[in-house]
């Protein structure tokens, strides 16, 4: 996990290259705080490497949008699956009750 910001900002430099959505494992945004008066964005890549991203970069802003969209889609999918499971359980329960009645 990224460092707890105590006496300084975590991001002294920011990534020199382009980060692709496919390589992202996690993306954390830190709001300004007493220890660091600016927004900081720390990406964790799928290979485990953590890197800082420049909040002012157009590419980074686009990446954040895509990441947030992906996260919300995953949440929707999860919720949908939960909903489906509940339906299946209800069906199974009703089937069992029918079976009990017929025996």
């Amino acid at each position: 996990t990224p460092v707890v910001r105590k006496g300084r900002c975590s991001c002294i430099s920011t990534n020199q290259g382009t980060i692709h959505l496919q390589s992202l494992k996690d993306l954390k945004q830190f709001a300004p705080s007493p220890s660091c008066e600016k927004i900081e964005i720390i990406a964790t890549l799928k290979n485990g490497v953590q890197t800082c991203l420049n909040p002012d970069s157009a590419d980074v802003k686009e990446l954040i949008k895509k990441w947030e969209k992906q996260v919300s889609q995953k949440k929707k999918q999860k919720n949908g699956k939960k909903h489906q499971k509940k339906k299946v359980l209800k069906v199974r329960k009703s089937q069992r009750s029918r079976q009990k009645k017929t025996t």
Partner: antibody
Amino acid sequence: QVQLVESGGGVVQPGRSLRLSCAASGFTFSNSGMHWVRQAPGKGLEWVALIGFDGINEYYADSVKGRFTISRDNSKNTLYLQMNSLRAEDTAVYYCARDWPEGYYNGMDVWGQGTTVTVSS
Amino acid sequence: EIVLTQSPGTLSLSPGERATLSCRASQSVSSSYLAWYQQKPGQAPRLLIYGASSRATGIPDRFSGSGSGTDFTLTISRLEPEDFAVYYCQQYGSSPPFTFGPGTKVDIK
């Protein structure tokens, strides 16, 4: 190729000022945190100052705090160290160095060749 | 302020031997924030290890870093003639100054 070139060193009297420059090339300067590190003759390395990639954050060693100012001009790809109220103990080779480019882990991965500052009356 | 102590001050070894250099911090340092450098006479330092154990670009695999908390180690598995130099550890704690250790000189026995 990735390069840092310091300039501005010289002989100066105690109490006077000097400004060091560090010209960067071959990498995205505006993404890079930059340091000044010095080495007195026959001694070890001493970290002097650091400026964040965007120039917002500056950090200093206690020995130079209030006397030295680190700054940068991202449009010119140049780092500066303004040294005021110089003392004999500031005599050293001054290196500029780039902070590790990933930003999260730290280390100085590119160094200049150094510029010599001699404070003497 | 975090103070770094390096030991030994000087290490006299022969080419082909294993070198073990120690760096001890006065307070705990995050592993992400410990680096090792090599410096040869008349040259600028060179980054060897960052994040306590990750080799910098172009650094041979005979160099390795380890440790956490207050105790860190740089190991050179088999010394090559070009490895005889001064080695410094440096910490980037949660607040400045980002101090260097006093250095360990590895010289030829």
